[in-house]
């Protein structure tokens, strides 16, 4: 069965996905969809990486890892309950039939009312979007961005300072996925499978 | 219009090889997975192979692996299906068909070649 | 493998009536079905895709539905034309398998 991710509408959700590549810069092709993981492909590809770059992408699917070194978790921005569902990170390694395929179960919760707003620092502040010009973008033209190195010691540091929000399981949840030395539990919310 | 023609087939020994191949035309070919499926005279339907837009990926019904190979050449918008070894109970009709596209979605064999004849008989 | 099983193996039907053709499959393959029609001496015809839509200039009386692993194909108010075998096929796991085929003749 899927492994099951949480987020509440409003959120950024995050669903991990990696691998190792080669060399450096010896990448592989990576599809995101939304719905299982067919035999081929991604069902409805949101987004899509080739030997280089991001090459296709769709609003609010982005990838805040660098995917130059593996990381291809994608980042859903501002979900709705209508996000919820399974979404499949095909890592497209070429061979006779050597894809990687991982089914990761969404389960989007409505907001909780929350009595007064807590100053937290923005997501999106501190894991930039990726930005990029190749490939078979949809309408909308976007221009070139850099990715910033954020480090595990970064990652640790924002969630401290996050801790009481919901967003910092996420970003706890980020460093432990980086780390991946085992598979990991946070919470009863979230259960986390290091696929590579 | 997107058209699938596939090479003609024959009668070979048992044995030896055969190459098919299969011209694209109507629409752009490595933007598709494509597949050859073949089919025993007055009998279903069987999957033989898959190849992703680029050759890179090949995909093949694990008992026709060590002898059937897929490749596409891009440039000439041709795919092809390399048969060694053949056996008698691959004679049948060999058809192409284009699969699934650069941006999903659409899972099915949208199109299909006329397809070739190839009996293997002594 | 995923083994698709197709009933029934054969339907006698006249012109006008309604028939259901149903494919279970072995294990869950979500909606990545498809339904193909194949007339005799012709080349298979994609009807329907992802279990229920319907595939570019494919009559209206023709519909998919089911997910999962229960399956069926619909023609509404039969036609000469529609006469001939029809295959379902699951696009989730590998090997592509196909089922065994339903041929629909004209009682």
């Known amino acids: 069965s899927e492994v099951e991710y949480r987020a509440e509408v409003g959120q950024n959700a995050y669903l991990p996905c990696f691998y190792t590549p080669a060399a450096p810069g010896n990448l592989v092709p990576v599809c995101w969809g939304k719905g299982a993981c067919p035999v081929f492909e991604c069902g409805n590809v949101v987004l899509r990486t080739d030997e280089r770059d991001v090459n296709y992408w769709t609003s609010r699917y982005w990838l805040n890892g660098d995917f130059r070194k593996g990381d291809v978790s994608l980042t859903i921005e501002n979900v709705t309950l209508a996000d919820s569902g399974i979404y499949c990170c095909r890592i497209q390694i070429p061979g006779i039939m050597n894809d990687e395929k991982f089914n990761l179960k969404l389960v989007i919760k409505p907001a909780k009312v929350t009595p007064a707003p807590t100053r937290q620092r923005d997501f999106t502040a501190a894991f930039p979007r990726m930005l990029t010009t190749r490939g078979h973008g949809p309408a909308e033209t976007q221009t070139l961005g850099s990715l910033p190195d954020i480090n595990l010691t970064q990652i640790s540091t924002l969630a401290n300072e996050l801790r009481d929000s919901r967003l910092a399981n996420d970003l706890r949840d980020s460093g432990a996925t980086i780390r991946g030395s085992s598979d990991y539990k946070d919470d009863d919310d979230k259960h986390h499978h290091h696929h590579h | 219009e997107v058209k699938l023609v596939e090479s003609e087939g024959g009668l070979v020994q048992p044995g030896s090889s055969m190459k098919l191949s299969c011209t694209a035309s109507?629409?752009?070919?490595?933007?598709?997975?494509m597949a050859w499926v073949r089919q025993v005279p007055e009998k279903g339907l069987e999957w033989v192979a898959n190849i992703n837009y680029d050759g890179s990926s090949t995909y093949y019904l694990d008992s026709l692996k060590s002898r059937f190979i897929i490749s596409r050449d891009n440039a000439k918008n041709i795919l092809y299906l390399q048969m060694n070894s053949l056996k008698s109970d691959d004679t049948a009709t060999y058809y192409c068909?284009?699969?699934?596209?650069?941006?999903?979605?659409?899972?099915?064999?949208?199109?299909w070649g006329q397809g070739t004849l190839v009996t293997v008989s002594a | 493998d995923i083994q698709m099983t197709q009933s029934p193996a054969s339907l006698s039907a006249s012109v006008g009536e309604t028939v259901t053709i149903t494919c279970r499959a072995s294990?869950?393959?979500?909606?990545?079905l498809a339904w193909y029609q194949q007339k005799q001496g012709k080349s298979p015809q994609l009807l329907v895709y992802n279990a229920k839509t319907l595939a570019e200039g494919v009559p209206s009386r023709f519909s998919g539905s089911g997910s999962g692993t229960q399956f069926s194909l619909k023609i509404n108010s039969l036609q000469p034309e529609d006469f001939g075998s029809y295959y379902c096929q699951q696009h989730y796991g590998s090997p592509l398998t196909f089922g065994a085929g339903t041929k629909l003749e004209l009682k």
């Open positions: 294990d869950n393959i979500y909606s990545y």
């Open positions: 109507g629409f752009t070919f490595s933007d598709y997975y």
């Open positions: 068909a284009r699969d699934v596209g650069y941006y999903g979605g659409n899972y099915g064999f949208a199109y």
